[in-house]
C-alpha cells in the first residue's frame, strides 16, 4: 500500500517535502515516477538511478529516500502530485498529493502594513 | 536551460575515438543521458544510455566495442576499432528510458573514419 | 528483443492534408512511445511523448494515439514547414534491444 500526506502546503519561495511512503512484505519497488499532473517531475529506477526532468532540473532535488525535494516554489505548482510505485511482483501503486502554495508571510505581513500605513 | 555541447572529427581505424559531451544546466547526478548516430542518408540508431548512478545499457550491436561514462559534467561514448561503418553524426541527448522523451538534443557531431 | 516498425517509409501529402504514420511494436510498451521530428542537418525534436502528450511548443496539428503495440502520429492541416523526417522510439525496456527507434517516415509536402 501507499502512505502519504494527502495534502500539504509551503511558502512561496519556499520548498517542500514531497513522500510517498511504499510497504509491502512480498514486493520489491522497481521503479517510482513523480508527476505533476500529466507531466513528469522525475523518476527513479533501480537500473539507472535518479532523472529529474529538464524542465524542472533547477528546481527540484531526488530524496529523501524516494521523494522530492521540491524548492523555489511559485504559486503555479499549487495542484496535483502523483507518485507511481512500479514494484515485483506486486504490481502499480499510486498516491496522491494535493499542494498549496500560499503566499509568503513575508508578503503578507508587508501587505499588512502597508495597509494600515497611514495616509499623507 | 539545458544545453549539449560534442565534438568529433575525422579518425582512422586504428584510434580509439572518444566523444565528449558537455552538459550545463542540468546535473549528471539526476540525469540519464543517451547516444544516438545517424549515418549519412540513414535512420536514427540508438548506442546506448548512462544512468545518474553510472549504470549502463548498450544496444546489442553496440556490445563490447562501445563504451559511455561520465564526469560531473561531461558524458563520454568511446568506440574502440572503430571501421568506416562507424562514419556517422553522433547526438548525445538527455534521457531515453521511460523519461516522457530524450530532450534536449545536442546538435550532433560528424565523425568519419576513414584509412 | 523490441522491435519498431514505422509505416511507410515515405509519404506524399499536400499542403492542408492529412498524414498519419504508424508505429507497431513487437510486443506491448505500455504507451511508453515517443515521436520525433527531423529536418536536415539538425538533431531530432521532441514532437509528442507517452504516446499522445504535446511536448512543450509543438502545434495541435500534430497528435498521437494508440495503446499496446499500436501506435500512430497524425499531422492534420498539413503545412509546408512538416515536411521533414519522423521516427517512433519506445522508452519500455533499453535491456537486449538493437534500436529504440522506428526506421522514420520521409513526409514531402507538395
Known amino acids: 500500500t501507499i502512505d502519504t500526506k494527502r495534502n500539504i502546503s509551503a511558502e512561496e519561495g519556499g520548498s517542500v517535502i514531497l513522500q510517498c511512503h511504499f510497504s509491502s512484505d512480498t514486493a520489491e519497488v522497481t521503479q517510482v515516477d513523480w508527476k505533476q499532473q500529466d507531466q513528469l517531475l522525475a523518476i527513479y529506477s533501480v537500473d539507472l538511478g535518479w532523472h529529474v526532468a529538464s524542465v524542472f532540473s533547477d528546481r527540484v532535488v531526488p530524496g529523501p529516500s524516494l521523494g522530492l525535494t521540491f524548492q523555489s516554489l511559485t504559486m503555479n505548482d499549487t495542484g496535483e502530485y502523483f507518485c507511481t510505485y512500479h514494484t515485483y511482483p506486486g504490481g502499480i501503486y499510486k498516491g496522491r498529493i494535493f499542494l498549496k502554495v500560499q503566499e509568503s508571510s513575508d508578503d503578507r505581513n508587508g501587505l499588512a502594513q502597508f495597509q494600515t500605513a497611514p495616509l499623507g | 536551460q539545458v544545453q549539449l555541447e560534442s565534438e568529433g572529427g575525422l579518425f582512422k581505424p586504428t584510434d580509439t575515438l572518444t566523444l565528449t559531451c558537455t552538459v550545463s544546466g542540468s546535473s549528471l547526478s539526476s540525469s540519464y543521458m543517451s547516444w544516438v548516430r545517424q549515418a549519412p542518408g540513414k535512420g536514427l540508431e540508438w548506442i546506448g544510455i548512462?544512468?545518474?548512478?553510472?549504470n549502463t545499457y548498450y544496444a546489442n550491436w553496440a556490445k563490447g566495442r562501445f563504451t559511455i561514462s561520465k564526469t560531473s559534467t561531461t558524458v563520454e561514448l568511446k568506440i574502440t576499432s572503430p571501421t568506416t561503418e562507424d562514419t556517422a553524426t553522433y547526438f548525445c541527448a538527455r534521457g531515453g528510458y521511460r523519461t516522457s522523451g530524450m530532450d534536449p538534443w545536442g546538435p550532433g557531431t560528424l565523425v568519419t573514419v576513414s584509412s | 528483443d523490441i522491435v519498431m516498425t514505422q509505416t511507410p517509409a515515405s509519404v506524399e501529402v499536400a499542403v492542408g492534408g492529412t498524414v498519419t504514420i504508424k508505429c507497431q511494436a513487437s510486443?506491448?510498451?505500455?504507451?511508453?512511445l515517443n515521436w520525433y521530428q527531423q529536418k536536415p542537418g539538425q538533431p531530432p525534436k521532441l514532437l509528442i511523448y507517452?504516446?499522445?502528450k504535446l511536448a512543450s511548443g509543438v502545434p495541435s496539428r500534430f497528435s498521437g494515439s494508440g495503446s499496446g503495440t499500436e501506435y500512430t502520429l497524425t499531422i492534420s492541416g498539413v503545412e509546408s514547414a512538416d515536411a521533414a523526417t519522423y521516427y517512433c522510439q519506445q522508452e519500455h525496456s533499453v535491456g537486449n534491444v538493437d534500436n529504440v527507434f522506428g526506421g522514420g517516415t520521409e513526409v514531402v509536402v507538395k
Open positions: 507517452d504516446a499522445l
Open positions: 510486443q506491448s510498451i505500455s504507451s511508453y
Open positions: 548512462i544512468g545518474s548512478n553510472g
